[in-house]
């Protein structure tokens, strides 16, 4: 079982945590990817695109792992049925790293001096190749982890957080839904700039396609900023009305999203959402809850805040 999972990961499905005996895997390419999909919880949803099956409480792993971050803009995914279209102003901007902030004094050009178009094209290609190499390295690390091998030296491991710390980070975080596919983390941060100090921004991407999923998480430095940010619920961001709600910390064994794929065993569960959230779950790309078939969850585990 473990070897099969590792082999599948090597073939391109490099997600999933752990590969111990008895680990169930559903090697189904990631469904979904529509804007606003996914419940706002799951501290595990923060991981940028790494997915695994829904975990039982006894299966939970205590060490988060580094996650791949696709850096180049993928081809624009077509909006799925029922999902809002890209909307006005959603053309993909240039890389946000190229834009200088107003009021800055430009310094040494370094390698950035504008030269002839041919040279610029070569530089762009080199950058693309660099990105591909980075992604391959991250993919390799994931495969090695699944095979219980240590990653190559020099790649520092993540800081291990306690469950309490992760839940506390969740309490300072918000879920942002219906995010335009062309949006960058910088643009999102700017939109929430007035709400307080931001610790991190993560736009989630599909592990298989690399396409943005249409939702994001923002972690603030304090809980007060979360309350302030809720005023931006239904505000316009890149021509789309975004959904802003507090990030929910998942409980053990409860899936954060329902993919609709039957599992090996059937388990009936009910999930109670408080009334303040029912508007979101009933009307925003949600699927019926509490049915017998449980779909494959995208959350890596219930407590991982990223």
């Amino acid at each position: 079982m473990a070897a099969a999972a590792a082999a599948a990961a090597a073939a391109g499905a490099a997600g999933g945590r752990g590969s111990g005996p008895g680990r169930r895997r559903h090697l189904v390419p990631g469904a979904g990817g529509e804007a606003g999909e996914g419940a706002p919880g799951g501290a595990g949803d923060y991981g940028n695109g790494l997915e695994s099956e829904e975990l039982e409480p006894e299966e939970l792993l205590l060490e988060p792992e580094p996650e791949p971050e696709p850096e180049e803009e993928p081809p624009r995914p077509r909006a799925p049925p029922g999902a809002p279209g890209p909307g006005p102003g959603s053309g993909a901007p240039g890389s946000q790293e190229e834009e200088e902030e107003p009021g800055l004094v430009e310094g040494d050009p370094g390698d950035g001096a504008i030269e002839d178009p041919e040279l610029e094209a070569i530089k762009a290609r080199v950058r693309e190749m660099e990105e591909e190499a980075e992604k391959l390295k991250e993919l390799q690390n994931e495969v090695e982890k699944q095979m219980n091998m240590s990653p190559p030296p020099g790649n520092a491991g993540p800081v291990i957080m306690s469950i309490e710390e992760k839940m506390e980070a969740d309490a300072r975080s918000i879920y942002v839904g219906n995010v335009d596919y062309g949006a960058t983390a910088e643009e999102l941060e700017a939109h929430f700039h007035g709400c307080g100090s931001v610790n991190r921004v993560t736009i989630l991407c599909d592990k298989f396609s690399g396409h943005p999923k249409g939702f994001a998480y923002i972690e603030f430095s304090d809980k007060e900023s979360v309350r302030t940010s809720l005023a931006l619920d239904e505000s316009l961001f890149r021509g789309r009305q975004i959904k802003v709600i507090p990030k929910r910390t998942n409980r053990p064994g409860i899936s954060t999203t329902d993919r609709g794929f039957p599992r090996a065993r059937y388990r009936a569960r009910t999930t109670n959402y408080n009334s303040s959230r029912s508007r979101f779950y009933s009307g925003f790309n949600s699927r019926p809850r509490g049915r017998v078939y449980r779909g494959r969850a995208r959350a890596t585990s219930w407590y991982s805040p990223y």
Epitope: Q96, E98, G110, R127, V198, N199
Partner: nanobody
Framework: AVQLVESGGGLVQAGGSLRLSCAAS????????MGWYRQAPGNQRELVAT???????SYAGSVKGRFTYSRDNAKNTVDLQMNSLKPEDTAVYYC?????????WGQGTLVTVSS
């Protein structure tokens, strides 16, 4: 995920120098932008210095000529050499990692400049 750890802050007299360092670990992408920001008490974070993916370094007008930004991609570190420090440079200095899909901030290091 990416972790950022700043170091080098401390108390210094006006006119003195300090060198701040930020070490990044985790899923680092070499094309990401890494910059230094600062936040004085009661103020919002402001950009101090940054380098774009094309190698262009930008500085806030108030630090131009006094602060120097450097980046070592091999070691995944960014440094900020601060010379001719002034009392108004007193702030918590933060390192920021910014890529297409992700932004991470460090915890900050306090720099106090006494007159």
């Amino acid at each position: 995920a990416v972790q950022l750890v700043e170091s080098g802050g401390g108390l210094v007299q006006a006119g003195g120098s300090l060198r701040l360092s930020c070490a990044a670990s985790g899923s680092i992408v070499s094309l990401a932008t890494m910059g230094w920001y600062r936040q004085a008490p009661g103020n919002q974070r402001e950009l101090v210095a940054t380098m774009s993916s094309s190698g262009i370094t930008s500085y806030a007008g108030s630090v131009k000529g006094r602060f120097t930004y450097s980046r070592d991609n091999a070691k995944n570190t960014v440094d900020l050499q601060m010379n001719s420090l002034k009392p108004e440079d007193t702030a918590v200095y933060y390192c920021k990692y910014s890529s297409r899909w992700n932004i991470y901030w460090g915890q900050g290091t306090l720099v106090t400049v006494s007159s």
